[in-house]
């Protein structure tokens, strides 16, 4: 018995179905086919779980969280024992193993391994200003999304006036900050943060209004 090489890893957007491939070749009939799918979740690597089981011509549910969401892609028994997972969740991310036994065919590689990563688009980021908005001050524009896998990158742009960040601005695309030194009246305006990753983007807006010093009456 020989389980074929798997593609290594699969990526899927949260909520979308995933197909985890596993095919094998055997010299024996499929009368005594036994297939166990296991997962080692990324969130709990020392707690493997059973996903689905085929034994004695019957299918059995695995861990409760997979109930109603998992099944074999084809009619069993078959040499294609790939499974689907519907409505994928973040907790489904992990390393999946298909263990195949088909007596009396023993020997060879009977395990296939596939990684599954459930991707999450960035949630609506939160924009805020840190620092004084008085003319001549330094300000930091902050942007962060609570959710996002892979981790989002953050890009700031100016939506009005000259449509560009001033030369004194420095961006940190990982932290989601833009630091603007020595702000002037021209720094005022609407700024947009674009949080993006492999499967989506999300934005927030921020209105920076630079405060000019008020002339003081002397008397």
């Amino acid at each position: 018995l020989e389980v074929s090489e798997s593609p290594g890893s699969i990526q899927v957007a949260r909520g979308q179905p995933a197909v985890l491939p596993c095919t094998f070749t055997t010299s024996a009939a499929l009368i005594n086919l036994n297939v166990i799918w296991m997962v080692t979740p990324l969130s709990n690597a020392n707690q493997p779980e059973q996903v689905i089981l085929y034994q004695g011509g019957q299918m059995f549910d695995g861990a409760p969280r997979f109930h109603g969401r998992v099944g074999f892609t084809g009619t069993m028994p078959a040499t294609n024992v790939s499974i689907f997972i519907n409505n994928t969740q973040l907790s489904d991310t992990g390393t999946y193993q298909c263990l195949v036994n088909n007596l009396p065919d023993i020997g060879g590689r009977n395990i296939g391994v596939t990684g599954l990563t459930v991707l999450v688009p960035p949630s609506a980021p939160h924009c805020q200003i840190q620092g004084s908005q008085d003319i001549g001050s330094d300000v930091i524009l902050l942007c962060s999304s609570e959710e996002g896998i892979p981790r989002p990158t953050y890009l700031w742009e100016k939506l009005d006036n000259t449509l560009k960040l001033p030369p004194t601005a420095t961006q940190d695309q990982v932290q989601g900050t833009v630091t603007i030194r020595n702000i002037s009246a021209l720094s005022s305006g609407l700024y947009q943060c674009v949080a993006s990753n492999a499967i989506g983007t999300s934005t927030c807006l921020l209105d920076l209004q630079v405060i000019s010093p008020q002339p003081r009456n002397i008397g």
Partner: antibody, heavy 121, light 110 residues
Framework: EVQLLESGGGLVQPGGSLRLSCAAS????????LSWVRQAPGKGLEWVSA????????LYADSVKGRFTISRDNSKNTLYLQMNSLRAEDTAVYYC??????????????WGQGTMVTVSS | ASVLTQPPSVSAAPGQKVTISCSGS????????VSWYQQLPGTAPKLLIY???KRPSGIPDRFSGSKSGTSATLGITGLQAEDEADYYC???????????FGGGTKLTVL
């Protein structure tokens, strides 16, 4: 080589449409705001439209507002100008221009060679 | 007509100095930066001055810029035959949320 290369110009009838493209190379496209500038035969420069780094912000000259649409595709390093309801007075050489990151104000530090748009019946 | 006013033409002899003015208002030049461009016949414009008085690398120091109130000025010293071109000022106008060029000035080197 750092350059901008416009294409898509040609002869079009009044009321017609045209889409100009500007392909950028040699620099990080998404780090610059960009503009379209035109020049009618024998006339001066006229700014047409501008767009921010990721396209969230756009500006238009009053003469083209509601008829022209500026857009960009950062994955293709390309700037576009969709021109609808064209008029004879839109006849001009159209340049794409890059706004300098070193300047506080507007400063076009890189220009394309231009593409000619002729609106005539 | 442009909201930025430039003289249609200026002329001077080689080696001389020439200035080109760009007049606007508080809603454009008065509260914003000015840039200047040179356009040789049949070619695309070239940036000469940005942020009122800064020169990009490669622009000779014969070219200078200044701003006072609602007017900007481009100065060219040691005039050369190859300086014969059209010159344009550019700024941003807060009132209309647009960029605006001056009408252009044709420089003739006598």
């Amino acid at each position: 080589e750092v350059q901008l290369l416009e294409s898509g110009g040609g002869l079009v009838q009044p009321g017609g449409s045209l889409r100009l493209s500007c392909a950028a190379s040699g620099f990080t496209f998404s780090k610059y705001s960009l503009s379209w500038v035109r020049q009618a035969p024998g006339k001066g420069l006229e700014w047409v439209s501008a767009i921010s780094y990721y396209g969230g912000g756009t500006l238009y000259a009053d003469s083209v507002k509601g008829r022209f649409t500026i857009s960009r595709d950062n994955s293709k390093n390309t700037l576009y100008l969709q021109m609808n309801s064209l008029r004879a007075e839109d006849t001009a050489v159209y340049y794409c221009a890059r706004d300098s990151r070193d300047a506080y104000g507007v400063a076009f530090d890189l220009w394309g060679q231009g593409t000619m748009v002729t609106v005539s019946s | 007509a442009s909201v930025l006013t430039q003289p249609p033409s200026v002329s001077a002899a080689p080696g001389q100095k020439v200035t080109i003015s760009c007049s606007g208002s508080s809603s454009n030049i008065g509260n914003n930066y000015v840039s200047w461009y040179q356009q040789l016949p049949g070619t695309a414009p070239k940036l000469l001055i940005y942020d009122n008085n800064k020169r990009p690398s490669g622009i000779p120091d014969r070219f200078s810029g200044s701003k006072s109130g609602t007017s900007a000025t481009l100065g060219i010293t040691g005039l050369q035959a190859e300086d014969e071109a059209d010159y344009y000022c550019l700024t941003w106008t807060g009132a209309g949320r647009i960029f605006v060029f001056g009408g252009g000035t044709k420089l003739t080197v006598l």
